[in-house]
Interface confidence: low
Amino acid sequence: VKVLHEPSCFSDYISTSVCQWKMDHPTNCSAELRLSYQLDFMGSENHTCVPENREDSVCVCSMPIDDAVEADVYQLDLWAGQQLLWSGSFQPSKHVKPRTPGNLTVHPNISHTWLLMWTNPYPTENHLHSELTYMVNVSNDNDPEDFKVYNVTYMGPTLRLAASTLKSGASYSARVRAWAQTYNSTWSDWSPSTTWLNYYEPWEQHLPHHHHHHHH
């Protein structure tokens, strides 16, 4: 039994760290392996995580952790029975992957705009609550070439979108992900998509027919 790609771990910096690794052959992760983890601090308890299979040779462990502070370092040991396969350390504050933003909704707003809203996945008392910036991806469900990416660098989890920037009568989907710049985090996973019909009509369509120009 041998580790092909050693464990790499990310923390949501509030309650959970997730480690993933790849074995050199298909492995029943939960039956054959255990990941032990312990906060590198006097008197800290040793915990054991039972991994699950993500693919036939890729294992994933989700570890409950206390509300992390920057200096926290965990000692990790990967075991196959009595055999130590890998040993390493993990500092959650250096490997942050934010939680996924939630409850993405789209609302018609004044002046032919759509208001996209979502929820910050962190409570206000958490360090990351005020650190998140977002990326919103808006795509035409029937035209893969028609997509837009918006970086939301201000605090509020909202985006105003002019309906005129989207094709009239087309169905669009949006999804959002988060990033914590000061922690040099990775991006969160994408939120589930929300879909809506862009029923805005360009103003030219209301002109008398002989004034209506087609642009090619």
Partner: antibody
Framework: QVHLKESGPGLVAPSQSLSITCTVS????????VSWVRQPPGEGLEWLGV???????YFHSALISRLSISKDDSKSQVFLKLNSLQTDDTATYYC?????????????????WGQGTSVTVSS | DIVMSQSPSSLTVSVGEKVTMSCKSS????????????LAWYQQKPGQSPKLLIY???TRESGVPDRFTGSGSGTDFTLTISSVRAEDLAVYYC?????????FGGGTKLEIK
């Protein structure tokens, strides 16, 4: 200074076995893996197999039945043995060190290579 | 086994020109655990052993001139030489180390006009 050097017989008769030794310096075989790669004349590179610091081995799927790789850590030597040679085993055989640990993850690229030893399979 | 395909098989350029060569993998080489692509590029000059140029698809090996750049992710990768020099005459190979058995592409032979 990392150095690898292959030594082989040069000429081997068909159906016989090929044995090549790779002698290394500048790193420990208990810490790093060594791969074997061959190159038929005028052709590309073909990975044959690897032996890791803990002694575990992995082989090219087409050669698994007739290839073995072993080592002597104390002598800093890695050994390749290929059985039942055919003419299409004619090639230059290289040993190469598997790369160092970088940025917290394993780098399995081959960062140092020997100069190669030419092997001809012919009667 | 993961199949690596390189194109073109050969190309001829003048000194100072920019060169790009392609490497495609039959399987994804991006490992989700660390967001790294397990792909290397090697240079083999005539009569010499291969030399490591790039690993992790885009990280230059120490001592390799910065005119060599690796890019790409997943299954499509590119090696670019920004301004070819006469000493770059060689065959360039890509290699995946995502899974066993490690496999090489067939090589791209760079010739100088």
């Amino acid at each position: 200074q990392v150095h690898l050097k292959e030594s082989g017989p040069g000429l081997v008769a068909p159906s016989q076995s090929l044995s090549i030794t790779c002698t290394v310096s500048g790193f420990s075989l208990t810490s790093y893996g060594v791969s074997w790669v061959r190159q038929p004349p005028g052709e590309g590179l073909e990975w044959l197999g690897v032996i890791w610091g803990d002694g575990s081995t992995y082989f090219h799927s087409a050669l698994i039945s007739r290839l073995s790789i072993s080592k002597d850590d104390s002598k800093s030597q890695v050994f390749l043995k290929l059985n039942s040679l055919q003419t299409d085993d004619t090639a230059t055989y290289y040993c190469a060190k598997q790369g160092t640990i970088y940025d917290g993850y394993y780098n399995y690229a081959m960062d140092y290579w020997g100069q190669g030893t030419s092997v001809t399979v012919s009667s | 086994d993961i199949v690596m395909s390189q194109s073109p098989s050969s190309l001829t350029v003048s000194v100072g020109e920019k060169v790009t060569m392609s490497c495609k993998s039959s399987q994804n080489l991006l490992y989700g655990g660390n967001q790294k692509n397990y792909l290397a590029w090697y240079q083999q000059k005539p009569g010499q052993s291969p030399k490591l140029l790039i690993y992790w698809a885009s990280t230059r090996e120490s001592g390799v001139p910065d005119r060599f750049t690796g890019s790409g992710s997943g299954t499509d990768f590119t090696l670019t030489i920004s301004s070819v020099r006469a000493e770059d005459l060689a065959v360039y190979y890509c290699q995946q180390y995502y899974d066993y058995p490690y496999t090489f592409g067939g090589g791209t032979k760079l010739e100088i006009k």
